[in-house]
């Protein structure tokens, strides 16, 4: 009973988490204009993974997609990839876990098969959650770096009194949705892995048979098979950073550097 509850809860938590990852990936508010120095702007900028938007005081909102692939920063591409991988793994995990649920009977599926499927889906949820958390964290780090870079040269003097205020971006709602969703998927995955241990048969369906010898008594009890899975991680962290060097064409072309972070 506890195993079924753990498995079911793990499935529901993962489902909510993956829905959240999908929502975060689609959201436009990954980064929003920092209003610290200008709380009463009549033009509010915010950006997502796929497009940047401007909401005007008039109520009009204009969004433009990033119609270039090669022109986008490598970090943004990496974040997109991580989120998509997270969604794909999560979706496959959900599909597998549906068939693995103890409360669902499919033909004469063995408990060992269900245990393996539960473990597989659990691992997929864990990786999916980690992908989402990593993606959101990479984007957040990119925002922090650019925030302090733009703060350093926030006001560029243009002949005395005139000032050009550079738009700074801060964390958008999508980042928090992504972190929470990734965490939920991760927790759901862990729960599925825990449930797997309870599903795996500790002993065979045959009763233990005792053989009584004349001199001494020996009981033979066939033992259950336990499978352990080990994970090896050999991820190399490579810092990809765009120092801000731009060709003349890049400076003039739309979208600008600040449209993605």
């Amino acid at each position: 009973m506890a195993v079924t509850a753990c498995q079911g809860l793990g499935f529901v938590v993962s489902l909510i988490g993956i829905a959240g990852i999908i929502a975060a990936t689609c959201m436009d508010q990954w980064s929003t204009q920092d209003l610290y120095n200008n709380p009463v702007t009549a033009v509010f900028n915010y950006q997502g993974l796929w497009r940047s938007c401007v909401r005007e005081s008039s109520g009009f909102t204009e969004c433009r997609g990033y119609f270039t692939l090669l022109g986008l920063p490598a970090m943004l591409q990496a974040v997109r990839a991580l989120m998509i991988v997270g969604i794909v793994l999560g979706a496959i995990g959900l599909l597998v876990s549906i068939f693995a649920l103890k409360c669902i009977r499919i033909g004469s599926m063995e408990d060992s098969a269900k245990a393996n499927m539960t473990l597989t889906s659990g691992i997929m949820f864990i990786v999916s959650g980690l992908c989402a958390i990593a993606g959101v964290s990479v984007f957040a780090n990119m925002l922090v770096t650019n925030f302090w870079m733009s703060t350093a040269n926030m006001y560029t003097g243009m002949g005395g009194m005139v000032q050009t205020v550079q738009t700074r971006y801060t964390f958008g709602a999508a980042l928090f949705v992504g972190w929470v969703a990734g965490g939920l998927t991760l927790i759901g995955g862990v729960m599925m892995c825990i449930a797997c241990r309870g599903l795996a048969p500790e002993e065979t369906n045959y009763k233990a048979v005792s053989y009584h010898a004349s001199g001494h008594s020996v009981a033979y009890k066939p033992g259950g098979f336990k499978a352990s899975t080990g994970f090896g991680s050999n991820t190399k962290n490579k810092k990809i950073y765009d120092g801000g060097a731009r060709t003349e064409d890049e400076v003039q072309s739309y979208p600008s550097k600040h449209d993605y972070v």
Epitope: N38, T41, A42, V43, S52, G59, D259
Partner: antibody
Framework: EVMLVESGGDLVKPGGSLKLSCAAS????????MSWVRQTPEKRLEWVAT????????YYLDSVKGRFTISRDNAKNTLYLQMISLRSEDTALYYC?????????????WGQGTSITVSS | DIVMTQSPSSLSVSEGEKVTLNCKSS????????????LAWYQQKPGQPPKLLIY???TRESGVPDRFTGSGFGTDFTLTISSVQAEDLAVYYC?????????FGAGAKLELK
């Protein structure tokens, strides 16, 4: 045809109060952000206050903050400006204006204005 | 607050003449998010409310004659009337539409010579 008609202007004593109204017609009032702009006797234009379509956000000129309140009744298609603690520098012709949806926050339609004179 | 400075404050012109009115803002009115400049130009004739001519620094409002042209970027903007007509004699105001308070320039009065 878009029409904005202001009313409520009067001669008031310093410290007095007044409520201006602006009746709108010819467009879906609730969709548009509305503003009050005043023109001083020296013919200078001065933005006073803005209220967004749903009424959730309001913006004010610093010198009128706490004294003026912009509000709207979308059911009656009417914009209001409640003014208290009036000063002599509030003497002006008050215009009600509509912020165009696709006009980059520019005021695309204006009323004929209502005059306020603050004098003892 | 963003200060809008207009020049000249008044201008005497002959009919058919080309006129250039300038407007300078103390801060950039350019928005990087959509690559637009948030500046408007208005025309006010005696006894009438202001009328929108140009928005987004260069977009002509519908119904405005094509002799009116807006240009500029960031902090420096221009309103050009290619061939002044008698009906163009009025006061012209520029306005910051980027940041509250939405400040106006002092105006430029166009008079007949």
């Amino acid at each position: 045809e878009v029409m904005l008609v202001e009313s409520g202007g009067d001669l008031v004593k310093p410290g007095g109060s007044l409520k201006l109204s602006c009746a709108a017609s010819g467009f879906t009032f609730s969709t548009y952000t509305m503003s009050w702009v005043r023109q001083t006797p020296e013919k200078r234009l001065e933005w006073v206050a803005t209220i967004v379509g749903g009424g959730g956000y309001t913006y004010y000129l610093d010198s009128v903050k706490g004294r003026f309140t912009i509000s709207r009744d979308n059911a009656k298609n009417t914009l209001y400006l409640q003014m208290i603690s009036l000063r002599s520098e509030d003497t002006a012709l008050y215009y009600c204006a509509r912020m165009g949806l696709t006009q980059r926050n520019a005021l695309d339609y204006w009323g004929q204005g209502t005059s306020i004179t603050v004098s003892s | 607050d963003i200060v809008m400075t207009q020049s000249p404050s008044s201008l005497s012109v002959s009919e058919g003449e080309k006129v250039t009115l300038n407007c300078k803002s103390s801060q950039s009115l350019f928005n990087s998010g959509n690559q637009k400049n948030y500046l408007a130009w208005y025309q006010q004739k005696p006894g009438q409310p202001p009328k929108l001519l140009i928005y987004g620094a260069s977009t002509r409002e519908s119904g405005v004659p094509d002799r009116f042209t807006g240009s500029g970027f960031g902090t420096d903007f221009t309103l050009t009337i290619s061939s002044v007509q008698a009906e163009d004699l009025a006061v012209y105001y520029c306005q910051n539409d980027h940041t509250y308070p939405l400040t106006f320039g002092a105006g430029a009065k166009l008079e007949l010579k």
